[in-house]
Interface confidence: medium
């Protein structure tokens, strides 16, 4: 029962996480115009992985896609790649985990097969979550690094669009969605891996016992019994993931002056 609950919860948490990663990837607000000290503006600028937008005070919003690939900063390309890899791995993980769910019976699928599939999907979710967290963190670090390396006359934007000093960008909602979603996917993956431990079959090697009944002889050999509950002696929960999250400011790498924001 506990295994089914852990597996089911892991699946649901991962599902929510992956939905969040997809949402974050599609969102336009990865970096938003910094409104601190400057709450009233005629236009509000924000940028995503795929396009940049301008919202006028009238409510009219105009977005322009980044129609160049070569002109975009390598860091932005890396973030796109990380998010897409995260989504793909997460989607495959979801597909695999559906068939691995204990509550769903597909033909005469062995518990060992379900355990392997659960572990596979768990690992996929963990990697997916890490990809999303890495992607979002790289982007955040890119924004902050750009600010720390900037001077008054060095403000250029995505794809070479020049910005004035007055347009400064800070963390957008998509970054926070991405961090939370990545974390949820990671947690879901860990739960799937824990559930896998409970699903794993344990060979209970009983000695063959012969029962001599009157009239005829029946030999009962229970050696093939599989313990499929999670309460076996070998169900210690191993720590699957012990990654310490670091803040964007602790990343002390100093990349070259890229032309983003």
């Amino acid at each position: 029962m506990a295994v089914t609950a852990c597996q089911g919860l892991g699946f649901v948490v991962s599902l929510i996480g992956i939905a969040g990663i997809i949402a974050a990837t599609c969102m336009d607000q990865w970096s938003t115009q910094d409104l601190y000290n400057n709450p009233v503006t005629a236009v509000f600028n924000y940028q995503g992985l795929w396009r940049s937008c301008v919202r006028e005070s009238s409510g009219f919003t105009e977005c322009r896609g980044y129609f160049t690939l070569l002109g975009l900063p390598a860091m932005l390309q890396a973030v796109r790649a990380l998010m897409i890899v995260g989504i793909v791995l997460g989607a495959i993980g979801l597909l695999v985990s559906i068939f691995a769910l204990k509550c769903i019976r597909i033909g005469s699928m062995e518990d060992s097969a379900k355990a392997n599939m659960t572990l596979t999907s768990g690992i996929m979710f963990i990697v997916s979550g890490l990809c999303a967290i890495a992607g979002v963190s790289v982007f955040a670090n890119m924004l902050v690094t750009n600010f720390w390396m900037s001077t008054a006359n060095m403000y250029t934007g995505m794809g070479g669009m020049v910005q004035t000093v007055q347009t400064r960008y800070t963390f957008g909602a998509a970054l926070f969605v991405g961090w939370v979603a990545g974390g949820l996917t990671l947690i879901g993956g860990v739960m799937m891996c824990i559930a896998c431990r409970g699903l794993a079959p344990e060979e209970t090697n009983y000695k063959a016992v012969s029962y001599h009944a009157s009239g005829h002889s029946v030999a009962y050999k229970p050696g093939g019994f599989k313990a499929s509950t999670g309460f076996g002696s070998n169900t210690k929960n191993k720590k699957i993931y012990d990654g310490g999250a670091r803040t964007e400011d602790e990343v002390q790498s100093y990349p070259s002056k890229h032309d983003y924001v």
Epitope: T145, W148, T170, F171
Partner: antibody, heavy 125, light 107 residues
Framework: QVQLVQSGAEVKKPGASVKVSCEAS????????MHWVRQAPGQGLEWMGI????????NYAQKFQGRVTMTRDTSTSTVYMELSSLRSEDTAVYYC??????????????????WGQGTTVTVSS | DIQMTQSPSSLSASVGDRVTITCRAS??????LGWYQQKPGKAPKRLIY???SLQSGVPSRFSGSGSGTEFTLTISSLQPEDFTTYYC?????????FGQGTELEIR
């Protein structure tokens, strides 16, 4: 309350280096930037640079590039400013000043709200 | 670099007077400006942040206004302790720059 306590006055010879310390207390050390500002006798204020105690990133004024090094020690909540190849024009009062920001709102500096008492550095042969 | 031009460089006034100090930025700095007061032999003290917000503990006779390139500090009714030096600081982009200062003296 928030306090910045700087090291004592220094007298140095031209060509030498000086290292001024600034110990912070009364707030979370890594949640604020630290600036260094100097003031030559009878002159105005001059911004030297900024350090982020969380991570150690720095940005220096072009004038001091290559001569100034700002570091921090999170275990003692102390920021250091080292100025090398001293010349007589470096005779000034050196101030550290806190710049409190909120990473969830914006990581941009918001200006110096609390200042140290100042450290007098005299460069004389 | 962004140049901050502060005017006047010195100003004579009497107790109770209303005075205005101006700071002009060489390019737009949004509202990323602070006003500081410095008494002889002391560290500067912030009076105004974000161009127009009063720092806590600062008397209400001090006020700031402006945005973009033009900023003003107004002292509505001068008190004896206000006769000292004032600086503006832009913290919009590196390198941060101060105005050259305004010395306020008793007439």
């Amino acid at each position: 309350q928030v306090q910045l306590v700087q090291s004592g006055a220094e007298v140095k010879k031209p060509g030498a280096s000086v290292k001024v310390s600034c110990e912070a207390s009364g707030y979370t050390f890594t949640s604020s930037y630290m600036h260094w500002v100097r003031q030559a006798p009878g002159q105005g204020l001059e911004w030297m640079g900024i350090i982020n105690p969380s991570g150690g990133r720095t940005n220096y004024a072009q004038k001091f590039q290559g001569r100034v090094t700002m570091t921090r020690d999170t275990s003692t909540s102390t920021v250091y400013m080292e100025l090398s190849s001293l010349r007589s024009e470096d005779t000034a009062v050196y101030y550290c000043a806190r710049d409190h920001y909120d990473i969830f709102t914006t990581y941009y500096p918001r200006g110096m709200d609390v200042w140290g008492q100042g450290t007098t550095v005299t460069v004389s042969s | 670099d962004i140049q901050m031009t502060q005017s006047p460089s010195s100003l004579s006034a009497s107790v109770g007077d209303r005075v205005t100090i101006t700071c002009r930025a060489s390019q737009g700095i949004r509202n990323d400006l602070g006003w500081y007061q410095q008494k002889p032999g002391k560290a500067p003290k912030r009076l105004i942040y974000a161009a127009s917000s009063l720092q806590s503990g600062v008397p209400s006779r001090f006020s700031g206004s402006g945005s973009g390139t033009e900023f003003t500090l107004t002292i509505s009714s001068l008190q004896p302790e206000d006769f000292t030096t004032y600086y503006c600081l832009q913290h919009n982009s590196f390198p941060f720059t101060f105005g050259q200062g305004t010395e306020l003296e008793i007439r």
